[in-house]
Amino acid sequence: SPYSSDTTPCCFAYIARPLPRAHIKEYFYTSGKCSNPAVVFVTRKNRQVCANPEKKWVREYINSLEMS
């Protein structure tokens, strides 16, 4: 999950494998101030998971979340 410094969440590692799409309710991008660009997926249990925005499954999930 993202590490929060001065209320700016940043990610230092990415989950590599896909999360179940049905478990994800929303997402957000971390700040440009963070050293690693990241997408944070928020699960239905309100857990936050860092993901690599360049991964295919991450892009696919973002697209489907935008459309829903």
Partner: antibody, heavy 119, light 108 residues
């Protein structure tokens, strides 16, 4: 180095249940998502389901929904797969396989447990 | 649910190149993993995320993914490469891992 050691072969009668165990050594079970895959004699690999640690939930393949239960005992670093209402078509080698959180793909597999269903 | 199609068998002479295909609708939009399974043994991951190799896997194993076909290529084939090979993808519509039917590689 992580290793998965599974329980021994089982012979069951139709209608019975079987519970296969998979012990993790070298790491703690918390470090992994554990999946279960089976292979019938002379057939291909079939994914049965797996644990999603980020959500504390288990996902099951539709085919096995209601008949399979996957559990984990973190105190002993052991995962379990129980399949009920066994039929002859369930005769297969059952594998546990790890899906490490920050590495794609099923990197480490157990040695397999042969389950034979026969009357 | 998502279907992956592999040829049942591929034959190749030692030293030559084996290409194993894995077909699926718009498979290029998915990350493909490949496993090698020798008789009586558990599968081994040889390529992940289309073209990356786990440590310990020879450079002779490579992968690609375009259009409706992903391909595992084994260069300079050796007798020890004789095995069954399976492709695998994540199907986000069903939240299931899906395996191809497997391809038996025979070294002549």
């Amino acid at each position: 180095q992580v290793q998965l050691v599974q329980s021994g072969a089982e012979v069951k009668k139709p209608g019975a249940s079987v519970k296969v165990s998979c012990k993790v050594s070298g790491y703690t079970l918390n470090d992994f998502a554990m999946h279960w895959v089976r292979q019938a004699p002379g057939k291909g690999l079939e994914w049965m389901g797996g644990y999603v640690p980020e959500d504390g939930d288990t996902i099951y393949a539709q085919k096995f929904q209601g008949r399979v239960t996957m559990t984990e005992d973190t105190s002993t670093d052991t995962a379990y797969m129980e399949l009920s209402s066994l039929r002859s078509e369930d005769t297969a080698v059952y594998y546990c396989a790890t899906d490490p959180l920050y590495t794609p793909g099923l990197y480490v597999w157990g040695q397999g447990t042969t389950v034979t269903v026969s009357s | 649910s998502y279907v992956l199609t592999q040829p049942p068998s591929v034959s190749v002479a030692p030293g030559q190149t084996a290409r194993i295909t894995c077909g699926g609708n718009n498979i290029e939009s998915k990350s493909v993993h490949w496993y090698q399974q020798k008789p009586g043994q558990a599968p081994v991951l040889v390529v992940y995320d289309d073209s990356d190799r786990p440590s310990g896997i020879p450079e002779r194993f490579s992968g690609s993914n375009s259009g409706n076909t992903a391909t595992l290529t084994i260069s300079r084939v050796e007798a020890g490469d004789e095995a069954d090979y399976y492709c695998q993808v994540w199907d986000s519509n069903t939240d299931h891992w899906v395996f191809g039917g497997g391809t038996k590689v025979t070294v002549l």
